[in-house]
């Protein structure tokens, strides 16, 4: 038994152009948290196996808000170690999966939203009881720096935590450098001494004299990075400074294949051969299985028919994404009809209906012809189980509640200015024109004869008296109609207002819960 410990040192944009400035989306601040998954073995099958050695989730980090114009810093991280206890022997070789998750804290109604920002998968060798191993990994445009170690918990000891150690009654009998320990016996033994000079950081030993290198390191003392230990197989002109061949540019330079995929060049492009459990153009899709618990927010995980096929998360209402990590903006589907206000309460949707409408989606129009639903002098026309309003001049919309803009079509000719009135419109004509729509040019001798009269209503205009009469009659009719409509509407709406008040009270309780 023992504990695997992971310490995240930094997470931030990687070097080079195109690095992201912020982990947060445009919707506002966010914070990070990490998930670690451990799988035994270094075999290619490891990708499909569950987190058999265990998994852990970090606390949420401090809230991060991007500062405009400021350089993108390393992001604030959660405090403390991620610890993954293991019950059985430490395997020595294992796969380490670290996921960086983003929790968005913007104006999401009903709580934060989660999304997977980066995932690194690395196969490693590590002896329990050894020193911290440091690592730097890139995941897309992000860079993650971390350290990890495995340590045994007494009475287990050794590089695999398989030997049991129990204190002697007289431990002083053990000499310097020896400890009271043995497989189920009381005797002293020395811990294995690695090869002299073996790197504390990149090497370890399970037997005396060994210097076994962690992945990526080589040499008798594990001091040489694998990438620099050989210059074979590279293309291009020879370098006089190192004696190595310097590679020319090629589609596989920098190895675009993720997760241990191998790159092979094709004409003008590249092809990745992925290890089992990874797929995609760049092997970027991980063969995580349901055993890894990949579905968030109560999503139901269903495994594929064969080991190579991916899991599927069936998300509960309100969540979407391959891991159910995204909260659905269900209001974006505009479920509330007739101008109703949509509220996503997380477990349910509510529509706040405009006056005159009701129902779960505001689909019921309370104004039918029986209730004289057409406002502003409009007349109700029934038909086909519905109704429509034939609106009076100057009004429009479903119930004639919207003031129509008769000037929208620019009816006044020759630069005349349009004014909307209850009766329709009036044109104020430019100098030199007259008529209801300023369509008639004025004779030159009449231009200065009537300067004081309002434009468009000139003394010589034969329509003047008719227009004034029409306006007076229409205004009187409209005022009378409005009075009748208001009285009848007050009676009819009283009962619905009670229901509205009751519904709003329920909604407030749900939002506060």
């Amino acid at each position: 038994a023992g504990v695997f410990e992971l310490q995240i040192h930094s997470f931030g944009p990687g070097p080079g152009p195109g690095a992201p400035r912020s982990p947060c989306s445009a919707r506002g601040p966010c914070r990070l948290f990490f998930r670690v998954c451990l799988k035994p073995g270094l075999s290619e099958e490891a990708a499909e196996s569950p987190c058999a050695l265990g998994a852990a989730l970090s606390a949420r980090g401090p809230v991060y808000t991007e500062q405009p114009e400021a350089p993108a810093p390393d992001l604030p991280l959660p405090n403390g170690l991620l610890q993954v206890p293991f019950r059985d022997a430490w395997p020595g070789t294992f796969s380490l999966i670290i996921e960086t998750w983003r929790e968005e804290l913007g104006d999401q109604i009903g709580g934060p939203a989660w999304s997977l920002l980066a995932r690194v998968t690395r196969r490693r060798r590590l002896a329990a009881g050894g020193p911290w191993a440091r690592d730097i990994q890139r995941a897309g445009a992000w860079e993650l720096r971390f350290s990890y170690r495995a340590r045994c918990e007494l009475p287990a000891v050794g590089t695999a935590c398989t030997r049991l150690c129990r204190p002697r009654s007289a431990p002083s009998r053990c000499g310097p450098g020896l400890r009271p320990c043995a497989p189920l016996e009381d005797e002293c033994e020395a811990p294995p001494v690695c090869r002299a000079g073996c790197s504390l950081e990149h090497g370890f030993c399970e037997q005396p004299g060994e210097c076994r290198c962690l992945e990526g390191w080589t040499g008798p003392l594990c001091m040489v990075p694998v990438s620099t230990s050989s210059c074979l197989g590279l293309r291009g002109p020879s370098s006089t400074t190192t004696g190595c061949l310097v590679p020319g540019p090629g589609p596989c330079d920098g190895n675009p294949c993720a997760n241990g995929g191998s790159c092979s060049e094709t004409p003008g492009s590249f092809e990745c051969t992925c290890p089992r459990g990874f797929y995609g153009l760049r092997c970027e899709v991980s063969g995580v299985t349901c055993a890894d618990g990949p579905c968030f927010n109560g999503g139901l995980c269903v495994g594929g028919a064969d080991p190579d096929s991916a899991y599927i998360c069936h998300c509960p209402p309100g969540f979407q994404g391959s891991n159910c990590e995204k909260r659905v903006d269900r209001c974006s589907l505009q479920p509330c009809r007739n101008g109703g206000l949509c509220l996503d309460l997380g477990h349910a949707l509510r529509c706040r209906c405009r006056a005159g409408f009701a129902g779960p989606r505001c689909e019921h129009d309370l104004d039918d012809c029986a209730g004289r639903a057409c406002a502003n002098g409009g007349t109700c026309v029934e038909g086909g189980g519905a109704h429509r309003c034939s609106c009076a001049l100057g009004f429009g919309g479903r119930n004639c509640r919207e003031r129509a803009d008769p000037c929208a079509a620019r009816p006044c000719a020759h630069g005349g200015r349009c004014y909307a009135h209850f009766s329709g419109l009036v044109c104020a004509c430019a100098p030199g024109y007259m008529g209801a729509r300023c369509e008639f040019p004025v004779h030159p001798d009449g231009v200065s004869a009537l300067p004081a009269a309002p434009p468009g209503l000139r003394p010589g205009d034969p329509q003047r008296a008719g227009v004034i009469a029409v306006i007076v009659v229409v205004v009187i009719a409209i005022v009378a109609g409005i009075v009748v409509l208001v009285i009848s509407r007050k009676k009819r709406m009283a009962k619905y207002e009670k229901a509205e008040i009751k519904e709003m009270g329920e909604m407030h309780r749900e939002l506060n819960a």
Epitope: V193, A196, G197, E210, G219, L221, S229
Partner: antibody, heavy 119, light 107 residues
């Protein structure tokens, strides 16, 4: 004290094989690498490879793969190097040495075995 | 492979003098270079390891310096028993390689 005692001079025919020995005393044999080094006049010292007796782990110089084979017998504290398909190029002094317990180098050497390959 | 160039190949000096022998690696080997002394009829002797660490039992007139690619063995105030062949060896990466040797002769 630590000592590495090597087998005596060998005179071999081309095409034959020979097994050189290196007996260790004065320390725990299994915990230190035994190194093998070739010395020819005008060629200086050449590292052939190494073996960790406790585990049998070996490392070879690519140049000597197929030529040299290392084994170790912890019961007799003896390391062996077998050289196969001998040619006159294999004529040399062969040394065994110990990689130190606390010293990052060869802290003890054998006296050397002279191999002569001649028809 | 890491090539080790040792110079000079021959060096004549007198007792009491100070001499230096150089080894240059074809690429960085950090500090992992050792110096050995070879004398007829005796087993090879480790003098310096990790570039500059004096092995136990070796007189303090022997000293080593350098890291990366350039290393130096200095013997100050030569004694008669110091006339021998000296080799350097890198043990940073496989295959381990030796310098060509320097024969220190009595002038």
């Amino acid at each position: 004290q630590v000592q590495l005692q090597q087998s005596g001079t060998e005179l071999m025919k081309p095409g034959a094989s020979v097994k050189l020995s290196c007996k260790a005393t004065g320390y725990t044999f299994t915990g230190n690498w035994i190194e093998w080094v070739k010395q020819r006049p005008g060629h200086g010292l050449e590292w052939i490879g190494e073996i960790l007796p406790g585990t049998g782990s070996t490392q070879y110089n690519e140049k000597f793969k197929g030529k040299a084979t290392f084994t170790a017998d912890p019961s007799s504290n003896t390391a062996y190097m077998q050289l196969s398909s001998l040619t006159t190029e294999d004529s040399a002094i062969y040394y065994c040495a110990r990689w130190g317990s606390t010293v990052v180098a060869y802290d003890y050497w054998g006296q050397g075995t002279t191999l002569t390959v001649s028809s | 492979d890491v090539q080790i160039t040792q110079s000079p190949s021959y060096l004549a000096a007198s007792p009491g003098e100070t001499i230096t022998i150089n080894c240059r690696a074809s690429k960085s080997i950090s500090k992992y270079l050792a110096w050995y002394q070879e004398k007829p009829g005796k087993t090879n002797k480790l003098l310096i390891y990790s570039g500059s660490t004096l092995h136990s039992g070796i007189p303090s007139r022997f000293s080593g310096s350098g890291s990366g690619t350039d290393f130096t063995l200095t013997i100050s105030s030569l004694e008669p028993e110091d006339f021998a062949i000296y080799y350097c060896q890198q043990h940073n990466e496989y295959p381990l390689t030796f310098g060509g040797g320097t024969k220190l002769e009595l002038k």
